[in-house]
Each structure stands twice: as C-alpha cells, then as structure tokens.
C-alpha cells in the first residue's frame, strides 16, 4: 500500500512539476523591467525565452518574437535547450511512469518490470527537474550580471546634457515558477526511485517448493506469508492446477486480497 501511495504521489508531484516547467518555458515574464523607485510606469518591458513584450499604461500590449537564431545570446539558447530537454525527459518519464504505476494492470506485466520502469521514470524526472532548475538559474545569473552592469551605466551622459535611461531587468514570475516546478519534478523523481525499491522482488535464500496435499489442489508454500518489509512482497498465495511443483521464482504474480501492507 505504501509503495502504491509513494509511487502515485511521486507521479502526481512530477506531473505538477512538469506542467510547471512547460508553463515557465512558455511564459513571457522571465525578466521584467526593474521599477526601482517608480512603481507606476508608462511603459513596462518584460521578456521571455521566445519573445519580448511591452505593456503601455494605456493597456496596449505588444509582443515581438525573436525571429533569429544566430543573433540571440548563447546563454539564452542554452536556457532554451535546458528547458526543452527538461520538458522532453519529463514527458517521456510521465509516459513510462503511467505504465509503471502499481495500481494500473497491463496484461501480465511482472513487478520487476514495473520496478525498472518506475526507476527509469524516477531518474528521468530527476534529470528533468535538474535541467529546469539549471536553466532558470543560468537565466537568473545572466540577469544579475546584466542588472549590475546596467546599474553602473545607469545614466550615460551625452555632453553632460542628455540622459539615456537604461532599462534594467529583474527576476520575472517565470523564474520562480521554474524553480518551484523543477523542485517538484525532482522530488517526484526521488519518490519514484524510493517506490522502485519496494516494487523490486526480494531475493529469498531457498526455493519454495509446492507440495500436493492428497485430494486437494491447494499448494502449500513455506514462507508464503512473510513479514512485510514495508515495500510489499512478491510472495503470493496461488492455486496450482497442473499438479507440478514450482519454485517461487516461476510463480507469476496476480492480485490477491493479501496484497497490502
């Protein structure tokens, strides 16, 4: 039960995280104009990974896409790449984790396969979260560097008469969304990896042999009701109809009323 809960929660947390990473990547407010001592501005600038926007106090908003690849800063390209890699890995991870969920039965998929898929999706979520956090952090670092550079050159005098106000940019909402989303995806991934440990079949030191009781087709398995480790066990009660003795390793897993912690 705890395994199912951990796995399910990891999936949901990762799902929210990846949705957040997608939202952050699409958002226009990665950097917003620093208003410093002027909270009311006639022209407000903000920029995303894909376009820059201007909102006038009249309410008119105009956004322009970056219709160039070569002309963009390498750092921006790197951030775009990290976010896209994060989304792709996260999406694949979600797809894999759906099939790995213990509560979902697909044919006769073994728990060991589910465990492997859970681990795979968990690792994908961790990498996805790290990509998002790295991407957002690189952009934030870029902003901080530019902020202090533009503060140093806040007013460039032209003959001592004309002043050119340099627009400074600070952290936009997308950065915080990205950090939180990346963190959630990372946590979800860790939870999936923890759940994987509980899903993996435990190795026993003996081969459990099924014996026939005369006149009954009910198998008796020594250690059939082992004390639970908290992560579930692969030993199940099972009726044997072919009259042959099997080792526990060969016995396929089916749901039973004892399948809980």
């Amino acid at each position: 039960m705890a395994v199912t809960a951990c796995q399910g929660l990891g999936f949901v947390v990762s799902l929210i995280g990846i949705a957040g990473i997608i939202a952050a990547t699409c958002m226009d407010q990665w950097s917003t104009q620093d208003l410093y001592n002027n909270p009311v501005t006639a022209v407000f600038n903000y920029q995303g990974l894909w376009r820059s926007c201007v909102r006038e106090s009249s309410g008119f908003t105009e956004c322009r896409g970056y219709f160039t690849l070569l002309g963009l800063p390498a750092m921006l390209q790197a951030v775009r790449a990290l976010m896209i890699v994060g989304i792709v890995l996260g999406a694949i991870g979600l797809l894999v984790s759906i099939f790995a969920l213990k509560c979902i039965r697909i044919g006769s998929m073994e728990d060991s396969a589910k465990a492997n898929m859970t681990l795979t999706s968990g690792i994908m979520f961790i990498v996805s979260g790290l990509c998002a956090i790295a991407g957002v952090s690189v952009f934030a670092n870029m902003l901080v560097t530019n902020f202090w550079m533009s503060t140093a050159n806040m007013y460039t005098g032209m003959g001592g008469m004309v002043q050119t106000v340099q627009t400074r940019y600070t952290f936009g909402a997308a950065l915080f969304v990205g950090w939180v989303a990346g963190g959630l995806t990372l946590i979800g991934g860790v939870m999936m990896c923890i759940a994987c440990r509980g899903l993996a079949p435990e190795e026993t030191n003996y081969k459990a042999v099924s014996y026939h009781a005369s006149g009954h087709s009910v198998a008796y398995k020594p250690g059939g009701f082992k004390a639970s480790t908290g992560f579930g066990s692969n030993t199940k009660n099972k009726k044997i109809y072919d009259g042959g003795a099997r080792t526990e390793d060969e016995v396929q897993s089916y749901p039973s009323k004892h399948d809980y912690v």
């Epitope: 006038e56 309410g59 004309v162």
Partner: antibody, heavy 118, light 113 residues
Framework: EVQLQESGAELVKPGASVKLSCKAS????????MHWVKQRPGQGLEWIGM????????NYNEKFKGKATLTLDKSSSTAYMQLSSLPSEDSAVYYC???????????WGQGTTLTVSS | DIVLTQSPSSLTVTAGEKVTMSCKSS????????????LTWYQQKPGQPPKLLIY???TRESGVPDRFTGSGSGTDFTLTISSVQAEDLAIYYC?????????FGSGTKLEIK
C-alpha cells in the same frame, strides 16, 4: 461617438475647494485611464494625474499631490477632480482626457474654466 | 522629470509652404523593448482642447491629414507640415509619453500670413 462632457465654469474664492466632473460616454468607461491636464491662460499644458475607472488606482504628478484628488463614480461613468486650498494661480482651464495606444490622449473634454478670485 | 524644449516658439508662414518644428527631450524617449519613441504631437486651435496628431513619434492618428508627418528618434523630434493650410493656424505641443509625470513642451505657435 466618444464624448467627455465636463462641468461648467466655476468662480471660487481663494482658499476654497472645488470639484470638477467629467462624464464619459460612447465607450467602455472602465477600460481606459482618465487623465487630467491643467492649462493656465496663454500658457502650456501640465499633467495633473490619472485614475483607472476599473481599479480606482491613481497616480499623481508630484507637483499636484495634496492639491488634486481624483475620484470616480462607475455607475454614472463620471470622473471627478477635487482641488483644495485654491490660490489665484490655480485659475486655469482643466481638461479630462482619455489615454490610448502610445500613451497619447485621443479624446479630450471641452475644458472647465476655473477662476479663483476674491 | 523630462523637459521638452520646442523651437521656434512661433513662426509665420504663407499657405502652401512647408513647415518644420522641433522638439528636443532632456532624456531619450526611445523604448528599447519595442524600438518605439514615446513622443506625441498635439494641435490646439484657439478656444479648443488639444487634438491628437501623431503618437509614437511618427504614427499618424486616424483622420489626421497626411500633410502632417512626425519624425525623429531618441531625443530629437520634428513635426513637418508639407503644405500649410489656413486651418492649420494653431499651437503645436509635443508630449513625453514615456515616463511619469507626462510632460509637455511649451508649444510652437503657427501663424498664417
């Protein structure tokens, strides 16, 4: 047709207060900032401040803080400007104007002439 | 606050002539975000409120005759009337639409001979 109808001319004594009105029609009142501009006789234009009819938020020219108070009545699509402690220098024509694209004023009221005289 | 200096303060021309008037700003009115200059031109005829002519330094307001042209960038702006008509008798004001408080130039009075 967009119209900004301002109240009639006012004659007040120095030190008194006055409330000017600007009734908007022909557009969605709550969608545009309403600005107020002062023009003294034979002189240029001075921006007083602005109010947003939807949120009620205001922004004033530092020079007019404490002098002008902008309010509105959404139900009647009317913006108001109260001017207090009036000296004779406040004698001027006061305009209300609607802000549009480019942060420009596309529609203006006809102006209210305020005369401060004893 | 941004200071706008208009010149000349007045000019007298004959109908059909080309007229240019200048507006200089103490700060750049060019917004880097959209590469637009936030300068507006108004025409005020005697006894009337100002009328919007040009915004974004060069965009003509609808209904404004095409003889009115705005140009310039950064700190130096010009309003040109290609062929002055008798009805163009007015005072022309430029306005900073970039930062609060909005400020206006002192105006250029256009008179017709």
């Amino acid at each position: 047709e967009v119209q900004l109808q301002e109240s009639g001319a006012e004659l007040v004594k120095p030190g008194a207060s006055v409330k000017l009105s600007c009734k908007a029609s022909g557009y969605i009142f709550t969608s545009y900032w309403m600005h107020w501009v002062k023009q003294r006789p034979g002189q240029g234009l001075e921006w007083i401040g602005m109010i947003h009819p939807n949120s009620g938020s205001t922004n004033y020219n530092e020079k007019f803080k404490g002098k002008a108070t902008l309010t509105l009545d959404k139900s009647s699509s009317t913006a108001y400007m109260q001017l207090s402690s009036l000296p004779s220098e406040d004698s001027a024509v006061y305009y209300c104007a609607r802000l549009k694209t480019g942060n420009s004023f596309d529609y203006w009221g006809q102006g209210t002439t305020l005369t401060v005289s004893s | 606050d941004i200071v706008l200096t208009q010149s000349p303060s007045s000019l007298t021309v004959t109908a059909g002539e080309k007229v240019t008037m200048s507006c200089k700003s103490s700060q750049s009115l060019l917004n880097s975000g959209n590469q637009k200059n936030y300068l507006t031109w108004y025409q005020q005829k005697p006894g009337q409120p100002p009328k919007l002519l040009i915004y974004w330094a060069s965009t003509r307001e609808s209904g404004v005759p095409d003889r009115f042209t705005g140009s310039g960038s950064g700190t130096d702006f010009t309003l040109t009337i290609s062929s002055v008509q008798a009805e163009d008798l007015a005072i022309y004001y430029c306005q900073n639409a970039y930062t609060y408080p909005f400020t206006f130039g002192s105006g250029t009075k256009l008179e017709i001979k």
